[in-house]
Every structure is written in C-alpha cells, then in structure tokens.
C-alpha cells in the first residue's frame, strides 16, 4: 500500500520520492531495507537522502533494492517503501517495457507529451526529445517547459518518445532520460448539440396503475468519442437520486454507436408498481454535452384496461 516502484538507468541521475507525505518541517529518515543501514544526508555521497527525496547521483545497478523512508511526525511515524531498480543501458535502440512510463494519448487538438518524473529534478530548459531514438527536428515539434507539443498530429506520430535533460546538483551535471508511449486517437468525429431521439417532446405515455413502466431517454451527441455527454431523467426538476422515491430508478442503457457512426446514449427510467401520484409528476429526459442541454418532457396518463364486455 505504501510502496512505490521507481526505475532508472546506470550512470544517470535518479531521484525517488517517499510515498508517505507530511509537513515540510517533518524529518524523513531513509534506510536501505536489506541491511537496515541508514542513508546519509551529506551531499558528498553518491546516494544521499534529502528530506522526502532519495537521490542517486549517479545510479548504479548495485543500488537496486527496497528503501524505507520514515516520516517522523509529532504523533506517529509514517513508513513508506521505494522499490528501486537500476538497469544497464541498452546498446540497441529499443526501450524495454520495464523502462516505460505510462502511455499517453493525443489527438489533433491535444498533443502534449509530458516528460515523466521531471518535477523531481533541478533541470533547465530546453528538454531534448527523441522518437524511436531519433532526435526530433522540424517546426511541428515544440519543446515547451516540461512537455513536447506536436502540431497537426497524424497517426504516424504514435511511438515511443524519450525526453532527455540535465539534472544539476551543487554544480555537477547528471543526465536523465525517460520514455513513454504516445498513441494517437482518431479524431474524425465531431460533437453537436444533443439530439433526443426518444421520447418525443411533450409525449404522453400510457401506463397501467399497479404495473411496472419503463421510459427510455435516448440521445445522440455527434460522431466518435465524446469528451462529455450524458443523458439523465429528472422528476419535477429534481435528480432521481435526490427525489427519494425508491420505486423510481434510472438505469444506464448501452452506449450505442449506430452504423452511421453517431455516438448515442440511453437512460431507462424504471417505475415499479405505478401509482396514481406518479401521473402528477413531470418526467424530463435531459441530454447534455459541451454544446448545451436539451430537455424533452413526458407525462404519464392512465391506460384504461380493455373492456371485455363491450
């Protein structure tokens, strides 16, 4: 629970954060778990502790292991563990999976690739960026602060991106590299003002007293992945969850993607054991996205049982 995985390459700087947090004035002690040996705080050491941070300047394969940090607070000590693995540098270009940070996705509109863990280091701009080991050149690529911006992203931009920067500690410079995968989302889609397919505006739905009834709110929001889209039911202008009638519940239907590629959502309102008072309520099907909100109102009316004597 209080353990975090960290990794790095030999002869590069690696800085690790204690998984436990505290106030800036709390002291933090670090130990090498296997030997229970205290990590020194003197900066002349290659591996030293600096408050919440453990610094390997530079790292060696032999540094791999579990490190314990203890945050000493007035009432109790908080113990955390940093599981550190230092790998040998690869001679070829491939970056193995175990050295990869989390994958990020981008699109034509949003193509920022953040350099992982950089906030831990004392670095100065600009960052160097590489894709599949090739230095990135050209006006489409812009190194900005701690991230890379790619203009006019195309599917070919997917791949492994490595950021390289220099960490400075007391005048000495150490190299750091970090790699993550970048995937490109197909953004042929679009978003439009919600279109409610059902129910019709001011629809009257016939129901039988004592029976169950279902109302379906169905709306479409555009094509492709929608950033924000929702359908929901309201009773007399109140959310179902807040209305407080356990007989009336809403249940998400299937995300629908019709053959024409439209992104649609369903929300089914289930009314158990329909009562007279249910006929007095106003049922609103709401569909909303970034463009706005559309509302269709439904009322219930009593369905007369078929008169078998006529």
């Amino acid at each position: 629970k209080f353990s975090k995985q960290s990794w790095g390459l030999e002869n590069e700087a690696l800085i690790v954060r204690c998984p436990r947090q505290g106030k800036p004035s709390y002291t933090v002690d670090w130990y090498y778990s296997q030997t229970n040996k205290s990590i020194p705080t003197q900066e002349r050491n290659r591996v030293f502790a600096s408050g919440q941070l453990l610094k390997f300047l530079p790292a060696a394969v032999a540094d791999s292991g579990i490190y314990t940090c203890i945050v000493r607070s007035p009432t109790f000590n908080r113990t955390g563990y940093a599981n550190v693995t230092i790998y040998k540098k690869q001679s070829d270009c491939n970056v193995p999976d175990y050295l990869m940070y989390s994958t990020v996705s981008g699109s034509e509109k949003n193509s920022k690739i953040y350099c992982p863990t950089i906030d831990l280091y004392n670095w100065t701009a600009p960052l160097e960026w590489f894709k599949n080991c090739q230095a990135l050149q050209g006006s489409r690529y812009r190194a900005h602060k701690s991230f890379l911006v790619i203009d006019n992203v195309m599917t070919e931009d997917a791949g492994d991106y490595t950021c390289k920067f220099i960490h400075n500690e007391n005048g000495a410079n150490y190299s750091v590299t970090a790699t993550r995968s970048f995937t490109v989302k197909d953004e042929q889609g679009f978003s439009l003002f919600p279109v409610i397919g059902a129910p019709a505006q001011n629809e009257i739905k016939e129901v039988e007293i004592g029976k169950n009834a279902n109302l379906t709110c169905s709306a479409c929001f555009g094509k492709g992945t929608q950033f924000l889209a929702a359908v929901l039911w309201q009773l007399n202008g109140t959310k179902i969850t807040d209305f407080g009638e356990p007989r009336i519940q809403q249940e998400e239907g299937q995300n629908q993607s019709f053959s024409n590629g439209l992104a649609c959502l369903d929300m089914v309102l289930r009314i158990a054991d329909v009562k007279e008072e249910d006929l007095l309520l106003q049922y609103d099907c709401l569909a909303l996205n970034l463009h706005g909100l559309r509302r269709h109102t439904v009322r219930l009316s009593r369905k007369n049982p078929i008169d078998h004597h006529s």
């Epitope: 629970k1 209080f2 998984p19 505290g22 106030k23 009432t75």
Partner: antibody, heavy 116, light 113 residues
Framework: QVQLVQSGAEVKKPGASVKVSCKAS????????MNWVRQAPGQRLEWMGW????????TYGDNFKGRVTITRDTSASTAYMELSSLRSEDTAVYYC?????????WGQGTLVTVSS | DIQMTQSPSSLSASVGDRVTITCKSS????????????LAWYQQKPGKVPKLLIY???TRESGVPSRFSGSGSGTDFTLTISSLQPEDVATYYC?????????FGGGTKVEIK
Amino acid sequence: QVQLVQSGAEVKKPGASVKVSCKASGYTFINYGMNWVRQAPGQRLEWMGWINTYIGEPTYGDNFKGRVTITRDTSASTAYMELSSLRSEDTAVYYCAREGDGFAYWGQGTLVTVSS
Amino acid sequence: DIQMTQSPSSLSASVGDRVTITCKSSQSLLYSGNQNNYLAWYQQKPGKVPKLLIYGASTRESGVPSRFSGSGSGTDFTLTISSLQPEDVATYYCQNDHSYPYTFGGGTKVEIK
C-alpha cells in the same frame, strides 16, 4: 503561482450526497497532501480529513468517518471530497487547503446548502 | 482530540493599539523530535477565505505584515498585533497543526472602536 480552484455552489436535499472538486495548479500536485476543511455559518473551522496525493491514501476526522470520501486524480491535479447522507447541519462552506506547516493555500470555498 | 480554546471571543480596540489574543490547547503542541510547536494562526475577513499568518507558533508567513507576531510553547500561545490597523478587522483562529484531527479555536472577532 499556487492556485486551488473549487467547483461551484450546490443545493442538496437531506439524505443526498455532494461531491466537491479542487483543481490545483502552480505546483507539483503529488508533492503535497490536500486537506478539506468546512465552516458552517457563524461557526469555527472544522477539519474533515486529508489525502496523500501521491499514493491516494486518505485520513478522515472521526466526526466524518463513514460519510466522507476523499479521492484524487493525479492526471487532472484534482482532489475530491464527497459527503453522503447530508443533513441540514452540513450546510457550510467547504474548503480544500494544501498541506504544509499551517495551511498557506486555500481554495475559494464551495457553499453547500442542504434544504428540503 | 485536542481542544483549542481562544480568548477573548471578541474585542474592540482603537487604531494603533496593541492587541493580544490567547489560545490554549488541551495537549502540548510541542514536538520534541524537532522542537517545533505545531500551532498556526489565521485571519478571516467576512465572506473571505482564511489567511495563514503564523505557523510553528512564531514563524510569520511570507507577505504578512511585521505587526503580527506569535509566541508561546507547549499549551499556551499568543497572537499579538503590535499596532492595530483598520484592515485588521477580522476573526482570528488558532489551529492545532500537531495531530489529527487538526482542530481550530472558536475564533476571536477583532473590531475597531
């Protein structure tokens, strides 16, 4: 500069739940814990709990255990506080405040009104 | 839980006066591990967010005017405004920053005579 921006005012019915968000900017989110503090009208400040933003571990005040849930989304640099089974006494301004020696940075506050 | 008791609950003073607010905690806020007193003072103006004035019982937060000072150790603490200014009209709270649950005093409302 450090900024904590909270979600807007909410009106809730007794028994309902409310979820307040707090978006952090101007610093590295996972470097500092996030506290939640509330203040009922004319009352003293009341600490509700905090979350270790790095590993996501929350700690709750005894008065709120079982009713409050504090979470975070590191990719969005946002902390959340959800309070359930609301009652009229929960009507208050809810603040997020960054952990430190004292709380130097506060959100602007979110007014939650609980009324039938 | 650590109880925080502030006095007075309200006071009225003239511009230029020296104002003293006291705060007592039910348990010591001194941490022997680093000799810090984990007590903070806040200023809150009507309808505004609390503002940190003092932490560690006596360390002034950056940007806070030098007329505000904090003192005390263990269980007894004091916030002093050496020369009250019109903009100091507010409610002042002390806070146990030592252990969970962090608790606040009941507040001292400061007004100008």
